[in-house]
């Protein structure tokens, strides 16, 4: 069953390589366990950046070595991706799955284009 997922069209990463955006889903049912996956699409290839499953009322925890962190509030997930470099510029897609209770729902956003600009090295001072 399909579900609508909204996310911003464009986000510019900070000079420290950190990008944040909100992924919002229109829950058709009473979701109590949700899985959020961030996918990166570049050159027609899609790779998984990170994923987390959380119970409503519990914090959203990614794996320890993940480049993602996040918090949830109602039907919104605030995602932060860190350690980004210019080469990581691409379309970051938010995929949301309502895992429990049944029935299972899946929603995929249109993607957020994240632009990453590597900071200019400081000029040597004589």
């Amino acid at each position: 069953k399909a579900m609508h997922v909204a996310q911003p069209a464009v986000v510019l990463a900070s000079s420290r390589g950190i990008a944040s955006f909100v992924c919002e889903y229109a829950s058709p049912g009473k979701a109590t366990e949700v899985r959020v996956t961030v996918l990166r699409q570049a050159d027609s290839q899609v790779t998984e950046v990170c994923a987390a499953t959380y119970m409503m009322g519990n914090e959203l925890t990614f794996l320890d070595d993940s480049i993602c962190t996040g918090t949830s509030s109602g039907n919104q997930v605030n995602l932060t991706i860190q350690g980004l470099r210019a080469m990581d510029t691409g379309l970051y897609i938010c995929k949301v799955e309502l895992m429990y209770p049944p029935p299972y729902y899946l929603g995929i956003g249109n993607g957020t284009q994240i632009y990453v600009i590597d900071p200019e090295p400081c000029p040597d001072s004589d």
């Epitope: 069953k1 009473k30 109590t32 366990e33 499953t53 119970m55 409503m56 009322g57 519990n58 895992m99 429990y100 209770p101 049944p102 029935p103 299972y104 899946l106």
Partner: antibody
Framework: QVQLVQSGAEVKKPGASVKISCKAS????????INWVKQAPGQGLEWIGD????????NSNQKFEGRATLTVDTSISTAYMELSRLRSDDTAVYYC?????????????WGQGTLVTVSS | DIVMTQSPLSLPVTPGEPASISCRSS???????????LYWYLQKPGQSPQLLIY???NLASGVPDRFSGSGSGTDFTLKISRVEAEDVGVYYC?????????FGGGTKVEIK
Amino acid sequence: QVQLVQSGAEVKKPGASVKISCKASGYKFTDHFINWVKQAPGQGLEWIGDINPNNGGTNSNQKFEGRATLTVDTSISTAYMELSRLRSDDTAVYYCARLRREYFYAMDYWGQGTLVTVSS
Amino acid sequence: DIVMTQSPLSLPVTPGEPASISCRSSKSLLHSNGITYLYWYLQKPGQSPQLLIYQMSNLASGVPDRFSGSGSGTDFTLKISRVEAEDVGVYYCAQNLELPLTFGGGTKVEIK
């Protein structure tokens, strides 16, 4: 090891209420949903409902809606089911069971059951 | 509600011989995500139910590999390749494609 220990047998009169407890140990209580299941004498299994220990959110079988109240006390890792307005056909063994997401929300650990007898 | 129907009601078995239990659902349990939301539980005499199989064919931890599950969207089978005395009890199929979760009526497996 994971354990769900339920309260003892109860004998109640029709119209009364009963509250059964289910104490969890051996895992983080707030990481798993708790389900409640009814088994009437010599009968099969019937799902009553579930509860999310994090926020107390519940899902219920409409058949028990309004009569079965599911709650938790996270400070003592205990789930409760209260059944009100008891009738003779509520005589049954009631089980609590933990859901496991790795098993796609199957009930992987069950309590030993609590026999509730409703008799005048 | 999704109705789960099991057969036979009772199954006398001989130790060492194979056994098979059928379960039918009133609606397909195969979701478009590729998952079949069908489970098997065993309730041994005087005990609480225990999980045997999840997602139609996956064995739960600690379940002997003489048990196997198979099926389509609505018709499912639990097989025991060689029955042992400890396998006696009531076997239940269950679905969690939709709420309410529902169980089959059970199949009682007993030694001949």
